[in-house]
Interface confidence: low
């Protein structure tokens, strides 16, 4: 069967197309090409008589067509109007006619697109931006790229106008990116240059650094304020509510206790019309903001009840601190047998009694900080039991031999565990 194949089927403007004939019959008188789906003398392109090898142009001949002896037709320098059907009419030697129709489509070579925007400086959480891919081209498909990736799925992104317009609703700073559009048709694909979206935002809540609260007299106070903002924020400082200066950094040399107070950083973005503040408390003091952990020293840790006395000393290198003592979570002294001396550094128990057995610890503190010692265990024996009757297994105290005192050691074992639990809780 006579057939026509278009090579290629989709043709770019300015290029050429070959209408290739298959299964051409033998013993031909001649053939003619027509524009359209039927034989119409008014639309004849060219005729060819085999005997004379003569080609005759018809009314639809444009000068761009070439006919080959095998009946194929080449059309050069294709224009948009060439789109459509072409019919080959074959006249055999027996004057019996045969026809076949083929077709092709013509598309323009796409120009490089560009992006127009309705808002070049949108404000975060407030504005929308519409990007439009120019120019509008018939039969073109429009695609969008963000940072060279295909569009993410988001309820804030909307495509319209045949995908030619991309709208971002309620822009955020994360929408600040490179945007490109691409146009495609069957014969070409072109991508635009990047447009970088600049979203205005902020200021966010300012951060004052460094984070220190406590300063010693004579030190230099240097504070810096930063708030994420586009365009960058303008900064001002207030001390105890009074305006000081319009700078990002605040510097006060050789501070005194009079410089203690509340320091406010005010950040303003004149374009977005937003402002934010952060307040920081500064304390200028001779006191140490970090009190070191004290240590307890005992004159002895195992004593004989109603006979021995004991001195516990709370050692610290810090100055300007106070000391307090604790026994079984109770503040000391708790009886007349207990005495504090040397500014509470030493706790004396004289004489020691059964109820004094257990854990002791001291705490050092100043108005702005405190720290506790590790606990110390005081063992109280009666009947002058020899020391070797006490054994230590896995930090638990047991009584070996003797009689009538197991309850006391069991109580001491419980106290020891309480002390260990307290110690782990606080450290």
């Amino acid at each position: 069967k006579l057939t026509i194949e278009s090579t290629p089927f989709n043709v770019a403007e300015g290029k050429e197309v070959l209408l290739l004939v298959h299964n051409l019959p033998q013993h031909l008188f001649g053939y003619s090409w027509y524009k359209g789906e039927r034989v119409d003398g008014n639309r004849q392109i060219i005729g060819y008589v085999i005997g004379t090898q003569q080609a005759t142009p018809g009314p639809a001949y444009s000068g761009r067509e070439i006919i080959y002896p095998n009946a194929s037709l080449l059309i050069q320098n294709i224009i948009q109007n060439d789109t459509g059907f072409y019919t080959l009419h074959v006249i055999k030697s027996d004057l019996v006619n045969e026809e076949a129709t083929g077709q092709f489509r013509v598309y323009p070579e796409l120009p490089k697109p560009s992006i127009s925007s309705n808002n070049s400086k949108p404000v975060e959480d407030k504005d929308a931006v519409a990007f439009t891919c120019e120019p509008e081209t018939q039969d073109a498909t429009y695609l969008w790229w963000v940072n060279n990736q295909s569009l993410p799925v988001s309820p804030r992104l909307q495509l319209s106008n045949g995908n030619r317009t991309l709208t971002l609703f309620n822009v955020t700073r994360n929408d600040s990116a490179s945007y490109k559009c691409e146009t495609q048709n069957p014969v070409s694909a072109r991508r635009s240059d990047s447009v970088i979206l600049n979203v205005l935002y902020g200021p966010d809540t300012p951060t004052i650094s460094p984070s220190d609260t406590y300063y010693r007299p004579g030190a230099n106070l240097s504070l810096s304020c930063y708030a994420a903002s586009n365009p960058p924020a303008q900064y001002s400082w207030l001390i105890n509510g009074t305006f000081q200066q319009s700078t990002q950094e605040l510097f006060i040399p050789n501070i005194t206790v009079n410089n203690s107070g509340s320091y406010t950083c005010h950040a303003n973005n004149s374009v977005t019309g937003c402002n934010r503040t952060t307040v920081k408390t500064i304390i200028v003091t001779e006191l140490s903001p970090v009190v070191a952990k004290p240590q307890i020293k005992a004159s002895k840790t195992t004593v004989t009840g109603d006979k021995d006395s004991v001195n516990l000393t709370c050692s610290t290198n810090d100055t300007g601190i106070s000391i307090r003592w604790f026994f079984k979570n109770q503040s000391l002294p708790s009886s007349e047998r207990m005495k504090l001396s040397q500014g509470n550094i030493t706790l004396s128990i004289n004489p020691v009694k059964r109820e004094d057995a257990g854990t002791y610890w001291c705490e050092v503190f100043n108005p702005i900080s405190k720290n506790q010692s590790d606990p110390i265990m005081l063992n109280v024996n009666y009947n002058a039991l020899p020391q070797e009757n006490l054994i230590n297994v896995d930090e638990q105290l047991y009584f070996q031999g003797g009689s009538g005192l197991n309850d006391i050691f069991e109580a001491q074992k419980i106290e020891w565990h309480e002390a260990r639990a307290h110690h782990h809780h606080h450290h």
Epitope: S176, D193, V199, G202
Partner: nanobody
Framework: EVQLVESGGGLVQPGGSLRLSCAAS????????IGWVRRAPGKEEELVAY????????RYADSVKGRFTISADTSKNTAYLQMNSLRAEDTAVYYC????????????WGQGTTVTVSS
């Protein structure tokens, strides 16, 4: 296609000067902020200088204040980093990076240019 190309790196003696350039194509730098970032082995990445071309805002790391100057020529679509009084600790690969918003990371990076300060 967006492209950033750095140049101007090289070997210089302590106390010497260099001028780094960052030529941009595929976008207009007047709507962006540009940072110079350096990376040295065993050190944290450091944003040494930053300029927002639409406001003229600049910011410098403490380590380069008074020695480095960042600038941009929007007509040439190029940013510069003038480095004076160079020290051994300034040795690094210097990258220029652009962002269209302040303080939130970078959209595009160049390939970097190496600066070596050594006697």
């Amino acid at each position: 296609e967006v492209q950033l190309v750095e140049s101007g790196g090289g070997l210089v003696q302590p106390g010497g000067s260099l001028r780094l350039s960052c030529a941009a194509s595929g976008f207009n730098i007047k709507d962006t902020c540009i940072g110079w970032v350096r990376r040295a082995p065993g050190k944290e990445e450091e944003l040494v200088a930053y300029i927002c071309n639409y406001t003229g805002y600049t910011r410098y790391a403490d380590s380069v204040k008074g020695r480095f100057t960042i600038s941009a020529d929007t007509s040439k679509n190029t940013a510069y980093l003038q480095m004076n009084s160079l020290r051994a600790e300034d040795t690094a690969v210097y990258y220029c990076a652009i962002t269209s918003y302040h303080g939130q990371g970078y959209n595009y990076w160049g390939q970097g240019t190496t600066v070596t300060v050594s006697s």
